[in-house]
């Protein structure tokens, strides 16, 4: 066969679907690789061909579109499973071609099993809700295109194993799940099961997402530097190790980049000749507020180093703050016989 533009295996699109459920998979060529859509390609006389490689096999084979009840079918740029089976797992290739043009891409499809509590190896999307923020909703994801708008599916919501009914502050409303006032106890995995009829058969779509209750923007504040502060003085003798922690609290802010850095005499540590190391640790509260600690360390401090200005800086979407550490050289303890005696006028 003539040359084909092969985009390889698109592992970015690791598609996971549940066993014994319908799945509709769009050819990634039109979404990520080509600058035209399927309709344009079809109008130009290009044909979309599907084939696959079974799990743990090397042999590419055509997809069998003649299975009973059209279990696998193709519609435009979509490959349909009605429903999937466990052994449908493999790498699928869609190829767009005519006599003069060819482009193809492969992608992995994994059919996964779930237990009666919807636990599975499926990677779950995370939806963040603000704590005590008023009514917030999550929507049953990725169910578009499975049934026409004339079909009215039944939707059942679960938290873990349990059907959501009579919960304190969570109300199922069709495709939406409303949280009247989100609390830490609402953290967890939520599943919608969408049941719809098609050609005399009943299909189920299971979608699970993780809800994480996070700090509310109503309570968000600019970064707070807990250390260094005015109460602690870093008093060292030359040759000792100087350790100064910079500890900063950041309120949770959606999509905010939290930054902490030190300057020494107004310069970044990388830009000066001192032998300084900085170690960072990060911890999170239950609502994803963040505490970052950067410890500035100089193994053997010199008297010059003890005269420098050490400033901790912090920045988030809420603002920027800075705080200087109080560093000074320890005055050597007086030697009694000489210094104190002189002080008392002894000769």
């Amino acid at each position: 066969s003539e040359r084909c533009d092969d985009w390889g295996l698109d592992t970015m699109r690791q598609i996971q679907v549940f066993e014994d459920e319908p799945a509709r998979i769009k050819c990634p060529l039109f979404e990520h690789f080509l600058k035209f859509n399927y309709s344009t390609a079809h109008s130009a006389g290009l044909t979309l061909i599907w084939y696959w490689t079974r799990q743990d096999r090397d042999l590419e084979e055509p997809i069998n579109f003649r299975l009973p009840e059209n279990r696998i079918s193709k519609e435009k740029d979509v490959l349909w499973f009605r429903p999937t089976l466990l052994n449908d797992t493999g790498n699928y290739t869609c190829m767009l071609r005519n006599t003069t043009y060819c482009s193809k891409v492969a992608f992995p499809l994994e059919v996964v099993q779930k237990d009666s509590c919807f636990n599975s190896p499926m990677k779950l999307p995370v939806h963040k809700l603000y704590i005590e923020y008023g009514i917030q909703r999550i929507t049953c994801p990725n169910v578009d295109g499975y049934f026409p708008s004339s079909v009215k599916p039944t939707i059942t919501w679960y938290m873990g194993c349990y059907k959501i009914q009579n919960f304190n502050n969570v109300i199922p409303e069709g495709m939406n799940l409303s949280f009247l006032i989100a609390l830490i106890s609402n953290n967890g995995n939520y599943t919608c099961v969408v049941t719809y009829p098609e050609n005399g058969r009943t299909f189920h779509l299971t979608r699970t997402l993780t809800v994480k209750v996070v700090g509310s923007p109503k309570n968000a504040v600019p970064p707070v530097i807990h250390s260094p502060n005015d109460h602690v003085v870093y008093e060292k003798e030359p040759g000792e190790e100087l350790l100064i922690p910079c500890t900063v609290y950041f309120s949770f802010l959606m999509d905010s980049r939290n930054e902490v850095w030190w300057t020494i005499d107004g310069k970044k540590p990388d830009d000066i000749t001192i032998d300084v190391t900085i170690n960072e640790s990060i911890s999170h509260s239950r609502t994803e507020d963040e505490t970052r600690t950067q410890i500035l360390s100089i193994k053997k401090v010199t008297s010059e180093d003890l005269k420098r200005s050490y400033v901790c800086h912090a920045r988030s979407a809420k603002g920027e703050v800075a705080k200087a550490a109080k560093v000074k050289q320890k005055v050597p303890a007086p030697r009694y016989t000489v210094e104190l005696a002189c002080g008392f006028g002894a000769t």
């Epitope: 237990d115 009666s116 509590c117 636990n119 938290m159 873990g160 194993c161 349990y162 059907k163 959501i164 009914q165 009579n166 919960f167 304190n168 969570v170 106890s185 609402n186 967890g188 995995n189």
Partner: antibody, heavy 122, light 107 residues
Framework: QVQLVQSGAEVKKPGSSVKVSCKAS????????IQWVRQAPGQGLEWMGY????????DYAQKFQGRVTITADESTSTAYMELSSLRSEDTAVYYC???????????????WGQGTLVTVSS | EIVMTQSPATLSVSPGERATLSCRAS??????LAWYQQKPGQAPRLLIY???TRATGIPARFSGSGSGTEFTLTISSLQSEDFAVYYC?????????FGQGTKVEIK
């Protein structure tokens, strides 16, 4: 090790209500579902319903809808089952049992209370 | 609701012998099945969950098998303390339902 301790035996008149308590000691209470099961004399086990204290969610078997109320008090780690409009066929031993956590698909009942005999008699 | 049917209703076995108890579901319950043992005047005790996993502290002579609609509890060598009533229970679909029980008695 978690233990479930139930309230004592009750004798009730037909048409009245009974409220049985189930106190958890020695471990987590909120994150588990507390299930209620009954057993009439010489009969098998019959699931009645559950409550999940942490989120307040509950569900009842169809047979008991409208007559049973299951509640929980997290502060005292106690669950309650109230059955109203009692009739003679409600004479049974009522058990509370710990179901698994929200995410454990082994939703079997691994820890049981000692049972509370409720006798309905005029 | 799913109906669980146990057989036989009564099983007469001599100590040291093997006992095989059967449980059938009216529709598939996958592997979401538990077995309980109940002695007179006591609460039930969990033996097996997930159709075949022994609960904590349950002796190895108890084993469970099956999936879908057909399940078996086997007691490989009956001890005197094993004479009791055994219940199966499905937890695949609400409401959770129990079988009517199998009484294992001394022959």
């Amino acid at each position: 090790q978690v233990q479930l301790v139930q309230s004592g035996a009750e004798v009730k008149k037909p048409g009245s209500s009974v409220k049985v308590s189930c106190k958890a000691s020695g471990g987590q209470f909120s994150e588990y579902a507390i299930q209620w099961v009954r057993q009439a004399p010489g009969q098998g086990l019959e699931w009645m319903g559950y409550i999940i204290p942490t989120v307040g969610g509950f569900d009842y078997a169809q047979k008991f809808q409208g007559r049973v109320t299951i509640t929980a008090d997290e502060s005292t780690s106690t669950a309650y089952m109230e059955l109203s409009s009692l009739r003679s066929e409600d004479t049974a031993v009522y058990y509370c049992a710990r179901g698994q956590t929200l995410y454990d698909s082994g939703r079997q009942f691994d820890i049981w209370g000692q049972g509370t005999l409720v006798t309905v008699s005029s | 609701e799913i109906v669980m049917t146990q057989s036989p209703a009564t099983l007469s076995v001599s100590p040291g012998e093997r006992a095989t108890l059967s449980c059938r579901a009216s529709q598939s319950v996958s592997s979401n099945l538990a077995w309980y043992q109940q002695k007179p005047g006591q609460a039930p005790r969990l033996l097996i969950y997930g159709a075949s996993t022994r609960a904590t502290g349950i002796p190895a002579r108890f084993s469970g098998s099956g999936s879908g609609t057909e399940f078996t509890l086997t007691i490989s060598s009956l001890q005197s303390e094993d004479f009791a009533v055994y219940y199966c229970q499905q937890y695949n679909n609400w409401p959770w339902t129990f079988g009517q029980g199998t009484k294992v008695e001394i022959k």
